[in-house]
């Protein structure tokens, strides 16, 4: 029987009974948070052979081996992973061995076995026989191998029963427990699975089979399962489902969901039965089971029960993620926040249509409304008292509405109202009237010319750049000296610059009034000599990188006809020169014959220009004499036995330091101090562990039902 869609067994070990008749778990299996040590010997699930997603074990007291629970678990497909892992064994306090002696294949994903204080038989398993790549496996903080004394079956009697393979240059027997070898198929089978009697399975089988060369006798399928047969692709009129089986249209239509999109059922797209159309596609009609490509971003209608959605934090904005049409009214009231502009753009940037009104008030954290970067239509179906559909009141730092050169916004019905926005120039409001088609709708008091823009440089002159010079990590720029009517009003200049891969940045990108700003800022004093043009050397830049730069004059708030004069430049795009690339990454060399070396590498992380070719140099090395000096028959002193507590940052210390050849003399040597690179790697490793642990806790801890 197929069980699913993922099974979560927690708190009570008796819930394991849910696995009784399962042959395939379509989804994940979680066994976790069972704090009372129980006797699991009476629980055995020999029917379970396949888990299509991942297996997660976390804090299950009393469980010593998985072999008795899942004696026939053969394949973990990893169709969906837990933080890149298909098998996670974490903080299993009593687990002594994994024991999954029939586990033959983890199709996708790596394994993470961490902080299991009593867990042995880890170095005796050759994971490369089970996984395609072992480089991402993370096996850390378990019982030290030297304390385990792992012995494979028959080793003590000097009649070893298991086969040997090489791991990390160590040729050894491979087993899961003291009495279970790790199964290996004859080399004649190649990548194919084999029976218990070492006969090769059908190429479409995965893991194992009950009869050789028979696609109906597979324990699991390499590709897809359909009507008792393993097939390379789903037959006509059937569709891939959950990455492992083929289902017909009727089956797909009859899947019931309890997730947010359940009202429309599953869809068939690109030969697959799936919960929703993939990114960039939309249903071809509300009752359709088929998807068609969207023109532009896919429409997503969001509705607010109470008609008006208040955006007063990032959390409230989060509810609008992906929405393109908002049915209702938007009330924006952002008084403070961290990195607010980019967060709002992330969650509200796709909104194109608001059916009601938009009201922005007391939003002192906002400098611009450009976070609503796709808003093109305010219908004004519902309006504020006084027939306003766009209302902007008391926003102390609002300087820009939108970049009107690249913005088309229509307000279909209703008027606009602006008051007490001291940094918002009236010219900006008048420009909005023209663009939105509301010119003539507003009465005299709707746009207050006295208290909008009273603290801004609304009459701006243009500063012109006069020269630019670049090197690999520097830019020198100069600009015309700005001369306001009264030269004493000019205080200094501020240069703004940032990396800009594309020529599409605006002054207000990522900027809010709470200190977040995607631009770097440098103050430039006036040159004492009136004939010298002001300029700056920007240094510490990246080679072969395009930067956007603009300059603003810092002036006294000098009022002339109720307006403050200021000056700023257009945005200039300028690229630094190319430089030497960083070193190529992951250089690997291997010999495939007595006269050839194959060398592979990845491109440098910092090309610093357009790479045109690589230079490969090699030279013959003399044999290392040290190899002959060491006595390989001598065993190092066995360290003092120490119980592993599941922590990681413990260095094993023996009573006497090892005596090695050191500095030309024999004598005790201290370990070399760690290099900066090693320290950095350790720091990153610790950080990565924390990130995983947080992910684990956030994923599995849920509030207790009320």
């Amino acid at each position: 029987e197929i069980c699913g869609p993922g099974i979560d067994i927690r708190n009570d070990y008796q819930q394991l009974k849910r696995l009784e008749n399962c042959t395939v778990i379509e989804g994940y299996l979680h066994i976790l948070l069972i704090s009372k040590a129980e006797d699991y010997r009476s629980y055995r699930f020999p029917k379970l052979t396949v888990i299509t997603e991942y297996l997660l074990l976390f804090r299950v007291a009393g469980l010593e081996s998985l072999g008795d629970l899942f004696p026939n678990l053969t394949v973990i497909r990893g169709w969906k992973l837990f933080y890149n892992y298909a098998l996670v064994i974490f903080e299993m306090t009593n687990l002594k061995d994994i024991g999954l002696y029939n586990l033959r294949n983890i199709t996708r994903g790596a394994i993470r076995i961490e902080k299991n204080a009593d867990l042995c038989y880890l170095s005796t398993v050759d994971w490369s026989l089970i996984l395609d790549a072992v480089s991402n496996n993370y096996i850390v903080g378990n019982k030290p191998p030297k304390e385990c004394g792992d012995l494979c079956p028959g080793t003590m009697e000097e009649k070893p029963m298991c086969e040997k393979t090489t791991i990390n240059n160590e040729y050894n027997y491979r087993c899961w427990t003291t009495n279970r070898c790790q199964k290996m198929c004859p080399s004649t089978c190649g990548k194919r699975a084999c029976t218990e009697n070492n006969e090769c399975c059908h190429p479409e089988c995965l893991g194992s089979c009950s009869a050789p060369d028979n696609d109906t006798a597979c324990v699991a399928c390499r590709h897809y399962y359909y009507a008792g047969v393993c097939v390379p692709a789903c037959p006509p009129n059937t569709y891939r489902f959950e990455g492992w089986r083929c289902v017909d249209r009727d089956f797909c239509a009859n899947i019931l969901s309890a997730e947010s999109s359940d009202s429309e059922g599953f869809v068939i797209h690109d030969g697959e039965c799936m919960q929703e159309c993939p990114s960039g596609f939309i249903r071809n009609g509300s009752q359709s089971m088929y998807c068609i490509p969207c023109e532009g971003p896919c429409p997503k209608v969001c509705e607010e029960e109470k008609k008006t959605k208040t955006i007063d934090s990032v959390t409230s904005a989060q509810m609008l993620q992906g929405c393109t049409i908002f049915k209702g009214n938007l009330l924006i009231n952002i008084r403070r926040g961290n990195n607010i502009a980019s967060e709002l753009e992330n969650f509200m940037g796709l909104i194109e249509v608001v059916t009601g009104y938009v009201k922005i008030r007391h939003s002192h954290a906002l400098v611009s409304l450009s976070f609503l970067k796709n808003l093109r239509l305010i219908l004004g179906e519902e309006q504020l008292e006084g027939n306003y559909s766009f209302y902007v009141l008391d926003n102390q730092n609002l300087q820009q509405l939108w970049d009107w050169d690249h913005r088309n916004l229509t307000i279909k019905a209703g008027k606009m109202y602006f008051a007490f926005n001291p940094k918002l120039c009236v010219s900006e409001i008048y420009r909005m009237e023209e663009v939105t088609g509301t010119k003539g709708r507003q009465s005299k008091g709707d746009i207050n010319t006295r208290n909008n823009g009273e603290r801004a440089s609304c009459e701006s002159d243009v500063l012109h750049f006069t020269s630019t010079t670049t090197s690999k990590n520097r830019i020198i720029i100069t600009w015309h000296r700005y001369r306001p009517p009264d030269y004493r009003d000019l205080i200094s200049f501020t240069v703004y610059y940032k990396e800009a891969p594309f020529k599409n940045v605006t002054e207000y990108d990522g900027q809010d009034a709470c200190g977040s700003n995607s631009w770097n800022m440098v103050d430039v004093d006036l040159p004492p000599n009136k004939d010298v043009e002001p300029g700056i050397l920007l240094h510490g830049l990246k080679p072969w990188t395009q930067y956007a730069v603009y300059v603003k004059a810092v002036t006294l708030t000098m009022v002339e006809n109720d307006h403050i004069r200021g000056a700023k430049s257009e945005i200039l795009y300028i690229r630094t020169n190319a430089s030497v690339p960083s070193i190529p990454l992951d250089v690997l060399s291997a010999s495939n014959s007595s006269s050839q070396l194959i060398v592979k590498w990845n491109p440098p992380s910092l090309p610093n220009g357009n790479l045109s070719y690589y230079i490969v140099r090699w030279q013959r090395q003399p044999q290392d004499g040290y190899l002959y000096r060491h006595n390989y028959c001598s065993k190092d002193k066995i360290p003092i036995r120490k119980y592993a507590d599941g922590t990681i940052d413990i260095e094993e210390v023996t009573e006497n330091p090892k005596t090695e050849v050191c500095g030309g003399e024999k004598g005790p040597c201290c370990a070399c101090p760690k290099t900066e690179a090693e320290k950095q790697a350790e720091k990153e490793e610790a950080e990565y562990r924390k990130v995983f642990e947080n992910f684990l806790h956030n994923s599995i801890f849920v509030p207790r039902p009320e």
Epitope: E1, I2, C3, G4, P5, G6, I7, D8, R18, E20, N21, C22, E26, F241, V247, F251, N254, I255, L256, S257, A258, E259, D262, S263, G265, Q275, P703, P705, E706
Partner: nanobody, 123 residues
Framework: EVQLVESGGGLVQPGGSLRLSCAAS????????MSWFRQAPGKEREFVSA????????RYADSVKGRFTISRDNSKNTLYLQMNSLRAEDTAVYYC????????????????WGQGTLVTVSS
Amino acid sequence: EVQLVESGGGLVQPGGSLRLSCAASMPTFSSFVMSWFRQAPGKEREFVSAISGSGSRSRYADSVKGRFTISRDNSKNTLYLQMNSLRAEDTAVYYCAANPRRATPDYTQYAYWGQGTLVTVSS
């Protein structure tokens, strides 16, 4: 602890009607697909009907199509089965079952089960 408690069973004449209820104690009732199964004496448990989390979609076994209606009230954490035109072969213990996230037509191993309520159709 998730609990499902069925009620509404009893003796009814052929052609009659009954309404079964299933009261669920779970934090987010709407995130479970709910189903009715039944088991007649000496027979295997069989699927009767299921309903999606929001209640907008449902499916039925061929033997009950047109006669039975499944519904749910998420505000009351309750599942219902309205049974009309009852026949003698509908006699069985009716079980309410819940599965998180989704249920395919071939899932019979639901996560949570009630104790059952007996429906007897006899003249």
